[in-house]
Interface confidence: medium
């Protein structure tokens, strides 16, 4: 851990490791019963991860601040590096034990060593993210997260090269969400769908998260999204361009959608 190659590696946590990955309900965090969590993993060709599988993944950097179902009705989450808001300052599997009430609602930890990869953690100065299968249409029931973390002081210039997602009022069906942070909780920028290219977005800091979700019906052409690192500006011009440039875009959707 610590500072290496200009990157804070203690914050670079794996999105998927040793076949283990985190899943949440389409409707948001902590919405899955045990049966539903099991079904989510099985739908993707996997199964709920065991405690051992989750711990093995944690040991190679799998860190998620969200409690989820594991095999045999167990609930917990993997913490690589303790933080003030997650894991009670501890590392390891934060274990809520085997739940007597299988109707409790949590997220899910799935295990599938053969699952199609999408998303990940990116520290390169430039990269292009593509919807799974691009240039072919993406599939139903996809969830992908791309986490970007660049060198401290750099900012991220995000631009949309191709964009074609199913339309729905308020982008409730298929969408890309952008967050000006390293998670999908803070710094919400917007939700995007349709086939008009969203405007470029510039982060306020050195981190950004992209989330892609497709629902159970109707797909479209998909997307290519490029980011480029912007080197620190001189002190005299710092802070002048920290907002996104997306508010004029025709398919920019402001606000959270958790109430629907």
């Amino acid at each position: 851990w610590g500072f290496k190659d200009g990157i804070f590696h203690n914050s670079i946590w794996l999105e998927r490791a040793a076949g283990v990955y985190h899943r949440e309900a389409r409707s948001g965090k902590y919405k899955l019963t045990y049966a539903e969590a099991k079904a989510v993993c099985e739908f993707e060709g996997g199964h709920l991860a065991t405690y051992k599988q989750l711990e093995a993944a944690r040991k190679i950097g799998f860190h998620v601040c969200a409690a989820g179902w594991m095999a045999k009705g167990r609930v917990g989450y993997p913490i690589v590096k303790p933080g003030p808001n997650c894991g009670f300052g501890k590392t390891g599997i934060i274990d809520y034990g085997i739940r007597l009430n299988r109707s409790e609602r949590w997220d899910a930890y799935c295990y599938n060593p053969h699952a199609k990869e999408c998303g990940g953690v990116f520290t390169d100065p430039k990269q292009i993210f593509k919807s799974p299968g691009f240039p072919n249409e993406y599939e139903d029931n996809q969830i992908c997260y791309w986490h970007i973390r660049l060198k401290y002081g750099q900012r991220i210039h995000l631009s949309f090269l191709d964009f074609d997602l199913e339309d729905d009022p308020g982008c409730l069906a298929d969408y890309v969400e952008i967050y000006d942070s390293y998670d999908d909780v803070h710094g919400f920028v917007g939700r995007y769908c349709g086939d008009e290219l969203p405007d470029d977005i510039i982060s306020t800091g050195n981190v950004m998260t992209l989330k892609f979700l497709s629902d159970a019906s109707v797909t479209a052409g998909g997307f290519q999204i490029k980011y480029v690192a912007m080197d620190p500006v001189s002190k005299s011009s710092q802070g002048k361009n920290t907002s996104t440039t997306s508010t004029g875009n025709k398919n920019f959707l402001a606000g959270r959608f958790s109430h629907l």
Epitope: D167, D168, R191, S217, G248, K250, L253
Partner: antibody, heavy 124, light 106 residues
Framework: EVKLVESGGGLVQPGGSLSLSCAAS????????MSWVRQPPGKALEWLGF??????????EYSASVKGRFTISRDNSQSILYLQMNALRAEDSATYYC???????????????WGTGTTVTVSS | QIVLTQSPAIMSASPGEKVTMTCSAS?????MHWYQQKSGTSPKRWIY???KLASGVPARFSGSGSGTSYSLTISSMEAEDAATYYC?????????FGSGTELEIK
């Protein structure tokens, strides 16, 4: 001519139920998302929910104020939209409109055709 | 949810007078739609996508704006324009309407 005509309104007691209908004509009903909007007397319009078209399996979305109490459904063979209202409250008193949703890319969604409206009064 | 505030709530104009009403959004929206409603009747689509006139709407009407500030303008008021006008957004769920501007003829 594209036309929407609501029916089923009336007086109902608090806690009661009521079902509203909206007969559609002049367009291919299955191709459109359909919505319900209400307007309390002398007040502004409020969106209640919508139901998607055939390609999306006729799934529905609701506003927070009616979710769990109101259900939108459709009979595509007869081109009728329904709003089933349960656990009615005094504040549900309003004129209820069905409206066709039109779009050509998000967020270009708007209500392009409105029904004539039917009045619901919730009072003891 | 995004709150749309319309002003003024009530206004009156003489025939031939220019009329402007505004709709302010609590957060930035991509487009604004406008509906006309006359007393005792259902709303009618009037202006969509901020500035496009619905079919049958006279050319004296226009719409403009961006971000959080939008407006509807009538270049020369006519008696038939007396109605309540509602703005509406669907840039974020749920879709919301403004409280309306009631336009009277003097």
């Amino acid at each position: 001519e594209v036309k929407l005509v609501e029916s089923g309104g009336g007086l109902v007691q608090p806690g009661g139920s009521l079902s509203l209908s909206c007969a559609a004509s002049g367009f291919t009903f299955t191709d459109y998302y359909m919505s319900w909007v209400r307007q309390p007397p002398g007040k502004a319009l409020e969106w209640l929910g919508f139901i998607r078209h055939k390609a999306k399996g006729y799934t529905a979305e609701y506003s927070a104020s009616v979710k769990g109490r109101f259900t939108i459904s459709r009979d595509n063979s007869q081109s009728i939209l329904y709003l089933q209202m349960n656990a009615l409250r005094a504040e549900d008193s309003a004129t209820y409109y069905c409206a066709r949703l039109y779009y050509y890319g998000s967020p270009h969604w708007y209500f392009d055709v409105w029904g004539t409206g039917t009045t619901v009064t919730v009072s003891s | 949810q995004i709150v749309l505030t319309q002003s003024p709530a009530i206004m009156s104009a003489s025939p031939g007078e220019k009329v402007t009403m505004t709709c302010s959004a609590s957060s930035s929206v991509s487009y604004m739609h406008w509906y006309q409603q006359k007393s005792g009747t259902s709303p009618k689509r009037w202006i969509y996508d901020t500035s496009k006139l619905a079919s049958g709407v006279p050319a004296r009407f226009s719409g403009s704006g961006s971000g959080t500030s939008y407006s509807l303008t009538i270049s020369s008021m006519e008696a038939e324009d007396a109605a309540t006008y509602y703005c509406q957004q669907w840039s974020s769920n749920p879709p919301t309407f403004g409280s309306g501007t009631e336009l009277e003829i003097k």
